[in-house]
């Protein structure tokens, strides 16, 4: 019987060009975590395997960093990164638990990053 629950950061937003940490946490189970997959819709981003450790997909090795913990850091965000992300916990003996995060990448605000003009 699967008793665990996955807590995630839920719906989050970040600015284009910035970075974001995706976090999931499995609780309420004593099952052993054998692997965590991080996936974006139809693409594998990275895995953290109990034996192998962290392994980043060659498709994302320049923009993804492992951690903190079992989380994942996405860097140099673009608007194309907007979408659903999944953390998939493979556990023994429970089986698979899946968490969902929706990330929205926003255009950088002119107020923060635009040119500043002084009016004489």
């Amino acid at each position: 019987m699967m008793t665990g629950t996955i807590e995630t950061t839920g719906n989050i937003s970040a600015e284009k060009g910035g970075s974001i940490i995706l976090q999931c946490h499995l609780s309420s189970t004593t099952a052993q975590v054998t692997q965590v997959n991080w996936e974006q819709q139809d693409q594998l981003l990275a895995i953290c395997n109990a034996d192998l450790g962290w392994h980043i997909s060659p498709s994302f090795k320049d923009r993804v960093a492992p951690g903190p913990g079992l989380g994942l850091t996405l860097q140099s965000l673009t608007v194309n990164d907007t979408g659903e992300y999944f953390c998939i916990y493979h556990t023994y003996p429970d089986g698979t638990y899946t968490g969902r995060i929706f990330l929205e990448v926003l255009e950088s605000s002119v107020a923060e990053h635009g040119a500043r003009f002084q009016i004489p």
């Epitope: 692997q35 997959n37 139809d42 594998l44 997909s57 498709s59 698979t96």
Partner: nanobody, 116 residues
């Protein structure tokens, strides 16, 4: 579950070539990372090369320019073309794969011996 079957290992002279194959069957949908690791006697298992479904690759520095990884998505098979083999390439080569939402799976290993 995913099953991996490797083939193509053997004995080859220094400077020679071999081609390893790794065929995946079972739950093989979605994106994947398929790759080759190797383990020489008394040494740790190390990544040799890997490839994704869209063809992005990564190589260990020690094999760049000599080894080429490729894949046939219609057959769920990855290939490792090994050229200019050196005695230090001698090892058991293991195929590994992770498919979308699935666990990491290992092949049984195939021995590559480079010797004159």
């Amino acid at each position: 579950e995913v099953q991996l079957v490797e083939s193509g290992g053997g004995l080859v002279q220094p400077g020679g070539s071999l081609r390893l194959s790794c065929a995946a069957s079972g739950r093989t949908f979605g994106d994947y990372i398929m790759g080759w690791f190797r383990q020489a006697p008394g040494k740790e298992r190390e990544l040799v090369a890997e490839i994704t479904r869209v063809g992005n690759t990564n190589y260990a520095d020690s094999v760049k320019g000599r080894f080429t990884i490729s894949a046939d998505n219609s057959k769920n098979t990855a290939y490792l073309q090994m050229n200019s083999l050196k005695p230090e390439d001698t090892a058991v080569y293991y195929c590994a794969a992770v498919f979308s939402r699935g666990p990491l799976t290992w092949g049984q290993g195939t021995l590559v011996t480079v010797s004159s």
